[in-house]
């Protein structure tokens, strides 16, 4: 189990202090009140590229 402040959660997940584990950011669409969703908002869940014409 990851402790807060150590290696970050994998991309698309965020640390939940309420559950003491990394949680999938996708669940924040259904339940945005979860404590870990704040961390999801700070970091996009998936990589993206800017495409220029």
């Amino acid at each position: 189990e990851q402790a807060p402040g150590t290696a970050p959660c994998s991309r698309g997940s965020s640390w939940s202090a309420d559950l003491d584990k990394c949680m999938d950011c996708a669940s924040c669409r259904a339940r945005p009140h979860s404590d870990f969703c704040l961390g999801c908002a700070a970091a996009p869940p998936a990589p993206f590229r800017l495409l220029w014409p």
Epitope: D18, R31, H33
Partner: antibody
Framework: EVQLLESGGGLVQPGGSLRLSCAAS????????MIWVRQAPGKGLEWVSY????????HYADSVKGRFTISRDNSKNTLYLQMNSLRAEDTAVYYC?????????????WGQGTLVTVSS | DIQMTQSPSSLSASVGDRVTITCRAS??????LNWYQQKPGKAPKLLIY???SLQSGVPSRFSGSGSGTDFTLTISSLQPEDFATYYC??????????FGQGTKVEIK
């Protein structure tokens, strides 16, 4: 067999203190979030407090915030509720309950309850 | 805070009857709704979680349905041991959970 056994209830005067315990057995205690729920005589269920598996995160109902403290000792498989500045309206049966194993969506095991009576 | 309102507050039914209890949330809670049964002097027992999933060991005569704000607990054929009080509980705002006021199922 999963078991939760509360203790520590009793009669206390207004303004007094009590410490409730909830001894867990039959499962590995440390990965599970836990809650306290109370039920006043003849009334419904009221959530009181939540604690994360490590004990690092705690939450309280507004009605008890600043007076009650939830804690746990994972080495002793025990959950606690320290109740200070008790009021008559805190009179209730207090239950501990175990959160689900993936999230705290539901509470699948409950103790038998311990009665707290606040009266002069 | 999300308020949970159950109806009816109490009902009288006979063994073998189909019983339906409704729970309404003050705002949408998706499917994050659980049902518990409580008998006098006993602890609550989980029946249904996440609106429609039957907890292990619970008889199949119990079923749950609904999403958003309106939910239903159905007992398809009431048995003597089913006379109890039933509570809904929302976990949409977990760990800040709230319960309905309860529905007492009595013998007619």
């Amino acid at each position: 067999e999963v078991q939760l056994l509360e203790s520590g209830g009793g009669l206390v005067q207004p303004g007094g203190s009590l410490r409730l315990s909830c001894a867990a057995s039959g499962f590995t205690f440390s990965p599970y979030p836990m809650i306290w729920v109370r039920q006043a005589p003849g009334k419904g269920l009221e959530w009181v407090s939540y604690i994360s598996p490590s004990g690092g995160s705690t939450h309280y109902a507004d009605s008890v915030k600043g007076r009650f403290t939830i804690s746990r000792d994972n080495s002793k498989n025990t959950l606690y509720l320290q109740m200070n500045s008790l009021r008559a309206e805190d009179t209730a049966v207090y239950y501990c309950a175990r959160g689900g194993d993936t999230y705290f969506d539901y509470f699948d095991y409950w103790g038998q309850g311990t009665l707290v009576t606040v009266s002069s | 805070d999300i308020q949970m309102t159950q109806s009816p507050s109490s009902l009288s039914a006979s063994v073998g009857d189909r019983v339906t209890i409704t729970c309404r949330a003050s705002q949408s809670i998706s499917g994050y709704l659980n049902w518990y049964q409580q008998k006098p002097g006993k602890a609550p027992k989980l029946l249904i979680y996440q609106a429609s999933s039957l907890q292990s060991g619970v008889p199949s005569r119990f079923s749950g349905s609904g999403s958003g704000t309106d939910f239903t607990l159905t007992i398809s054929s009431l048995q003597p041991e089913d006379f109890a009080t039933y509570y809904c509980q929302q976990s949409y705002t977990s760990p800040f959970i709230t319960f309905g006021q309860g529905t007492k199922v009595e013998i007619k």
